[in-house]
């Protein structure tokens, strides 16, 4: 349905508050270095313009596309060239190339200062003094650091952020009330950002079909009672929503997401019995709730898959005439029967099935050729099962910190060229799979673990893409979306790596380590561990453990000393010498 003025249409659909918030998010995700005040000014200008279009859709420029309007506005920023360099060249292009250009310049790791949380009283004062500015600043700071954050979901986070301050700034113990809520929002926010980044990478690097396949598998697990046609409709709509958000079309995305939530709730009887509670909530909570809803129960007495996908005489005809439909049905039927499998495993099985049909259907006896196709699935299923079993055992034996360290060593040996901060960040996140997933029963472990690992490895892939240093990482990241984890798992020690020159400065520590939080102290030690492996990639687990134990003792000792700085200087030299000797450096 064509509208005379797209900007008026979206303003009316979303309302002023959401319109302004989404435009701010869009601008902050494109121009990540611009000051808050500059963005607020641009947003206000766009909002005033939108209001003129609501009043008269035929007014000048109201018929322009949102990309044209927003791009023109972004290109008015005076400091574009000096702040963003070649991104300024985007402004010389016409739409749609200009928007594509802006998208290509989004930075997953922007050079921005770490967000330091002020004192609770300071935050509460700022919140009370100007609630609107305080919340806008939250949107701005998150959006610029997470340029692919799912915009409608960020509105939900902002709503919760506001609720936390509204409640806790009146509490007797403000800090006890507020800080856990902020920690929870921060951790959930990081997880949400990473999950959305994978969706965007899937769409942008592997295409719409890859995303749709993922969505068919996931929605079929979640809504196993829904018919294939219903799942297909939801997949089409969900793909449109995420394509829009990943493409910077945040107003359309938020609007379409609301429409999808409305449709799901109006048709919940034919979708899932688990949606009732979600559908009673207000819009933002409703959409979030639907996205996180638990899997419905599987229908009883589902027939064997073999009848339609192995034994039927029409298998090859159906495959050849409409691969998307036939393989989509295969994926749907397999996924709804297997909530215990990861989505990526289901996609591997579907790919194996497809490859077998492609190989067999032109043969003299196609059925004989593909009759044992389901047997080919067994090793594919067992591989992640065994890996998860082994790693959960290791996690239970070591605990999270030491499990992370084991992964740090493992991944540094696999891809030592990757920057130390990236290896630390990614390995720490990989290590969190233990506490996140190993507590689950067998039936929930694989979907939890392997799909989480896909999200974390995508972080490695997007960070590495910015400054590629390892052909092995590039290969695992680009060859197959669903085989990224097996590809990284299969990597052995990189024998071509030339060990890094020893630099004592890397292993010099100061008294400031004593005032760090436990998390920050862990990161310091893990950074040292990565550097150690880069210097001595052939070091054994035992050697590394001994050095790290000595290091932990050294930090503990010097943090208890009266003259901490002297202790770090003198004992540090001894530790470096002892470590070099222990590792044969």
């Amino acid at each position: 349905d064509a509208h005379k003025s797209e900007v008026a249409h979206r303003f009316k659909d979303l309302g002023e508050e959401n319109f302004k918030a989404l435009v701010l998010i869009a601008f902050a995700q494109y121009l990540q270095q611009c000051p808050f005040e500059d963005h607020v000014k641009l947003v206000n200008e766009v909002t005033e313009f939108a209001k003129t279009c609501v009043a008269d859709e035929s007014a000048e420029n109201c018929d322009k596309s949102l990309h044209t309007l927003f791009g023109d506005k972004l290109c008015t920023v005076a400091t574009l060239r000096e702040t963003y360099g070649e991104m300024a060249d985007c402004c010389a292009k016409q739409e749609p190339e200009r928007n594509e250009c802006f998208l290509q310049h989004k930075d997953d790791n922007p050079n921005l200062p770490r967000l330091v949380r002020p004192e609770v009283d300071v935050m509460c004062t700022a919140f009370h003094d100007n609630e609107e500015t305080f919340l806008k600043k939250y949107l701005y700071e998150i959006a610029r650091r997470h340029p692919y954050f799912y915009a409608p979901e960020l509105l939900f986070f902002a709503k919760r952020y506001k609720a936390a301050f509204t409640e806790c700034c009146q509490a007797a113990d403000k800090a006890a009330c507020l800080l856990p809520k902020l920690d929870e929002l921060r951790d959930e926010g990081k997880a949400s950002s990473a999950k959305q980044r994978l969706k965007c990478a899937s769409l942008q690097k592997f295409g719409e079909r890859a995303f749709k396949a993922w969505a068919v598998a996931r929605l079929s697990q979640r809504f196993p009672k829904a018919e294939f046609a219903e799942v297909s409709k939801l997949v089409t709509d969900l793909t449109k929503v995420h394509t829009e958000c990943c493409h910077g079309d945040l107003l359309e995305c938020a609007d379409d997401r609301a429409d999808l939530a409305k449709y799901i709730c109006e048709n919940q009887d034919s979708i899932s019995s688990k949606l009732k509670e979600c559908c009673e909530k207000p819009l933002l909570e409703k959409s979030h709730c639907i996205a996180e809803v638990e899997n419905d129960e599987m229908p009883a007495d589902l027939p064997s898959l073999a009848a339609d996908f192995v034994e039927s005489k029409d298998v090859c005809k159906n495959y050849a005439e409409a691969k998307d439909v036939f393989l989509g049905m295969f994926l749907y039927e397999y996924a709804r029967r297997h909530p215990d499998y990861s989505v990526v495993l289901l996609l591997r099985l579907a790919k194996t099935y497809e490859t077998t049909l492609e190989k067999c259907c032109a043969a003299a006896d196609p059925h004989e050729c593909y009759a044992k196709v389901f047997d080919e699935f067994k090793p594919l299923v067992e591989e992640p099962q065994n890996l998860i079993k082994q790693n959960c055992e290791l996690f239970e034996q070591l605990g999270e910190y030491k499990f992370q360290n084991a992964l740090l060593v493992r991944y540094t040996k696999k891809v030592p060229q990757v920057s130390t901060p990236t290896l630390v960040e990614v390995s720490r996140n990989l290590g969190k799979v233990g506490s996140k997933c190993c507590k689950h029963p067998e039936a929930k472990r694989m979907p939890c673990a392997e799909d989480y690992l896909s999200v974390v490895l995508n972080q490695l892939c997007v960070l590495h893409e910015k400054t590629p240093v390892s052909d092995r990482v590039t290969k695992c990241c680009t060859e197959s979306l669903v085989n990224r984890r097996p590809c990284f798992s299969a990597l052995e020690v990189d024998e071509t790596y030339v060990p890094k020159e020893f630099n004592a400065e890397t292993f010099t520590f100061h008294a400031d380590i004593c005032t760090l939080s436990e998390k920050e102290r862990q990161i310091k030690k893990q950074t040292a561990l990565v550097e150690l492996v880069k210097h001595k990639p052939k070091a054994t687990k035992e050697q590394l453990k001994a050095v790290m134990d000595d290091f932990a003792a050294f930090v503990e000792k010097c943090c208890k000393a009266d003259d901490k700085e002297t202790c770090f200087a003198e004992e540090g030299k001894k530790l470096v010498a002892a470590s070099q000797a222990a590792l044969g450096l």
Partner: antibody, heavy 119, light 110 residues
Framework: EVQLLESGGGLVQPGGSLRLSCAVS????????INWVRQAPGKCLEWIGI?????TTFYATWAKGRFTISRDSTTVYLQMNSLRAEDTAVYYC???????????????WGQGTLVTVSS | DIVMTQSPSSVSASVGDRVTITCQSS???????LSWYQQKPGKAPKLLIY???KLTSGVPSRFKGSGSGTDFTLTISCLQPEDFATYYC???????????FGCGTKVEIK
């Protein structure tokens, strides 16, 4: 040596019919998929259809109804009915690369046979 | 409707030149089902590349295929006298009935 050899081309009047043959030697035809592809003078290649080793056939959307592919033990046939001037082209038979069924990978081709539809 | 657009329709080049031919498909091809053929006057086409980037046995390594989804490229890195010919891309889709070829790029001597 593996060879595909088309025959049966020639001049035919609009509305007429023609049956082309593709004689296959050097391989056991019962194990391979064979396609028909045509090329109008100075124009694009155009896929007509395929017959799998099992005898199952598929056709380009535009070719359904007027064109029929069949086979015996050593020869693949293309039956063309209700011919029109725009069917004038060189007609090739071509083998699909073994191990594929629906992919457009044709590794062995005949030399082609010219069909002219004119009154 | 399936549309496969090859560009340029012709290119003049000299021996030793690098030549790039593009093939754009709408919609995207199925699972990188994209091939490149070489055809010389009066001859049948010859398969050079399949699965977008895999070289057929016996084809010189100066031929390189790349791309995925909707955009594909054939690059001849160092043109040889025997490379002057017409090049076609071929695409496979969700339905076998949609198998389509591009309309060719003629590589001529400058």
């Amino acid at each position: 040596e593996v060879q595909l050899l088309e025959s049966g081309g020639g001049l035919v009047q609009p509305g007429g019919s023609l049956r082309l043959s593709c004689a296959v030697s050097g391989i056991d035809l019962s194990n391979y998929a064979i396609n028909w592809v045509r090329q109008a003078p100075g124009k694009c290649l155009e896929w007509i259809g395929i017959i799998w080793a099992s005898g199952t056939t598929f056709y380009a959307t535009w070719a359904k109804g007027r064109f029929t592919i069949s086979r015996d033990s050593t020869t693949v046939y293309l039956q063309m009915n209700s011919l029109r001037a725009e069917d004038t082209a060189v007609y090739y038979c071509a083998r699909t690369v073994p191990g594929y069924s629906t992919a457009p990978y044709f590794d062995l081709w005949g030399q082609g046979t010219l069909v002219t539809v004119s009154s | 409707d399936i549309v496969m657009t090859q560009s340029p329709s012709s290119v003049s080049a000299s021996v030793g030149d690098r030549v790039t031919i593009t093939c754009q498909s709408s919609p995207s091809v199925w699972s990188n089902f994209l091939s490149w053929y070489q055809q010389k006057p009066g001859k049948a086409p010859k398969l050079l590349i399949y699965e977008a980037s895999k070289l057929t046995s016996g084809v010189p390594s100066r031929f390189k295929g790349s791309g995925s989804g909707t955009d594909f490229t054939l690059t001849i890195s160092c043109l040889q006298p025997e490379d002057f010919a017409t090049y076609y891309c071929g695409g496979g889709y969700s339905s076998i009935s949609d198998t389509t070829f591009g309309c060719g790029t003629k590589v001529e001597i400058k």
